[in-house]
């Protein structure tokens, strides 16, 4: 009875050895495996078993040449040949690699399937075991982040379109009670690209919407600001002295009304004062204090509280000037000193005036949001690397390159 159990164990091990070696030399892996391709060139395709047993997944199964030879001699695939001295193996020259034409690539694509829903701690062996009864699988690619963490999704290449279709159409597939999302690889990328595109469109529309809302708020605030300033404008005009300046106006109204802004340039014959309170009151107080005769540098002046459309236009201009002044101040990153046009408005706080823009990488949430490697629609100047990590190589070669096609 125990012997029977041992036989079963041995048969299972041999099947795994065959499967692993046939994967290494198979249609899918071999064209992508730099190291193995180099080895094949050296001796008419023969690769010493000494080298083969350094491949991690085979190494984990056995390092015994006899076991490997025995296993391969029983293989029904008849892909591999064993040298007479039983120390080397090669892919049978009667089974050459298919020519990698567009037609062949298309065929592979059409039998490639995306499966999502595996726990991120699932191993390749777990997945292989799950796929065991699901059709003939040529390659399993565990999709990983740049930091090599498994994402919980895989690409599987079946041996035929029929077996891929059969798998995809099997309802209610689960991995340990977890529902899976199963799509042909092509359709997965279509879904992902659609998601990306939609989210981009949404983000743009949203930004536009927020911009419009912001603009409306600003306009509302401006209107409110205008309303608050109604009746606060005082126009002055006359044959003014060329040396008349803003300071004269501040002195004249110093105790009668707080001046927010003066629209006046030296040498002009008229200007406008914006008071915090009603202009009429400030003018009245100033007149009273000056016996009814309010002059600038001993020159007669006509004083007029603005109203109606004239007032609105003047207010708009003042608000624009204030904004312009504020922007200038911001860009210079320091306080103005009362120079330039109309600038006795209180300046904003003491910020350094620096604006930092931080680069922002957009991530699309749904599905594989952290899809650093991505075929189709790769962004940026460099086409992103294939998601082909966990390459099987002799240990000595492993840190040097990750050139394989999958995780088998």
């Amino acid at each position: 009875m125990a012997e029977n159990g041992d036989n079963e164990k041995m048969a299972a091990l041999e099947a795994k050895i065959c499967h692993q070696i046939e994967y290494y030399f198979g249609d899918f892996n071999l064209p992508r495996d730099k190291f193995l391709k180099e080895q094949i060139k050296l001796d008419e395709g023969w690769v010493p078993l000494e080298i083969m047993i350094k491949f991690n997944r085979l190494n984990r199964l056995t390092t015994d040449f006899n076991v490997i030879v025995e296993a391969l001699s029983k293989s029904k695939a008849e892909l591999m040949e064993i040298s007479e001295d039983k120390t080397k193996i090669r892919r049978s020259p009667s089974k050459p690699l298919p020519e990698v034409t567009d037609e062949y690539k298309n065929d592979v694509k059409n039998r490639s399937v995306y499966i999502k829903g595996f726990p991120t701690d699932a191993t390749l062996d777990d997945i292989k075991e799950w796929l065991e009864d699901k059709g003939q699988v040529l390659n399993i690619q565990m999709r990983r982040t740049l930091h090599k963490a498994f994402k919980g999704s895989i690409f599987v290449v079946f041996d035929s379109i029929e077996s891929a279709k059969k798998f995809v159409e099997t309802p209610g597939q689960k991995y340990k009670e977890t529902d899976l999302l199963i799509l042909f690889k092509d359709d997965y990328f279509a879904k992902k690209n659609e998601e990306r595109k939609q989210n981009k469109v949404e983000a743009k529309l949203r930004a536009k919407q927020e911009q419009e809302a912001k603009q409306k708020l600003e306009e509302d605030a401006e209107m409110k600001s205008l309303e608050e300033k109604i009746g606060c404008l005082l126009k002055f005009s006359g044959d003014l002295d060329d040396q008349t300046c803003r300071e004269d106006l501040h002195i004249l109204f110093s105790n009668h009304g707080e001046i927010k802004w003066i629209d006046f340039v030296r040498g002009a014959k008229e200007g406008i004062i914006l008071f915090k309170e009603k202009a009429k009151e400030a003018l009245g107080k100033a007149k009273d204090a000056n016996n009814g005769n309010l002059q600038l540098r001993n020159k007669e002046v006509t004083w007029e509280v603005l109203e109606g459309e004239v007032e609105k236009e003047a207010l708009k201009k003042i608000i624009e000037d204030q904004q312009e002044s504020l922007n200038k101040w911001k860009s210079k990153g320091r306080r103005f000193k009362g120079k330039g046009k109309g600038n006795k408005a209180a300046q904003p706080g003491s910020g350094k005036g620096k604006v930092q823009f931080q680069g922002k990488k957009t991530k699309f949430a749904s599905d594989d949001e952290h899809d650093e490697h991505d075929e189709n629609g790769a962004t940026g100047p460099v086409k992103r690397a294939r998601e082909e990590t966990d390459k099987e190589e002799p240990a000595s070669k492993q840190q040097k390159t990750e050139n394989g096609a999958g995780d088998q």
Partner: antibody, heavy 116, light 106 residues
Framework: QVQLQQSGAELARPGASVKLSCKAS????????ISWVKQRTGQGLEWIGE????????YYNEKFKGKASLTADKSSSTAYMQLSSLTSEDSAVYFC?????????WGQGTLVTVSA | QIVLTQSPAIMSASPGEKVTMTCSAS?????MHWYQQKSGTSPKRWIY???KLASGVPARFSGSGSGTSYSLTISTMEAEDAATYYC?????????FGGGTKLEIK
Amino acid sequence: QVQLQQSGAELARPGASVKLSCKASGYSLTNYGISWVKQRTGQGLEWIGEIYRGSGNSYYNEKFKGKASLTADKSSSTAYMQLSSLTSEDSAVYFCARGGLSFAYWGQGTLVTVSA
Amino acid sequence: QIVLTQSPAIMSASPGEKVTMTCSASSSVTYMHWYQQKSGTSPKRWIYDTSKLASGVPARFSGSGSGTSYSLTISTMEAEDAATYYCQQWISNPPTFGGGTKLEIK
């Protein structure tokens, strides 16, 4: 601007079949999925299936296999859904919708009434 | 398939009131999407990827949640918010919708 334009209302006899259409416009992707969603009067939404314009592959909700058949005409960017062996249970509004993993765009819906 | 259960099925709120509706999944999902549907019209994507507002959706709406529990909140109810809201997941085929929450104005 993505738009999904669906065909007009259908009145059919029990046992008959109807074929609804959904024309997509305003999109640059060559391969994308069009889903079909059923809504009975005063009821919720049920996903019937999805067909991909580029690959021609279709995916079905098990519940609607044998009832709905999805096809697509690549050249006219039109998706079709044929409903067969109609019963009163099939009386509903059928929407086509587009999206990644959510449905950002919807057709206006086609009302199917099954009545003897 | 994943079953989504929405509660309450029907609710009413006064203008200005805060409204919260929930969506519970029979197993864990990564993201939840929400749709608004008014009588006689197509559903509109309202919130996607759990918390992102679709364009045109007022900022008073928000979405949150993780795992099996998700919610949609309106900070201050307005008359135009009266509609039926559906949650939806697509973590696996078939994608499924919740039964809907009908929100009425008091």
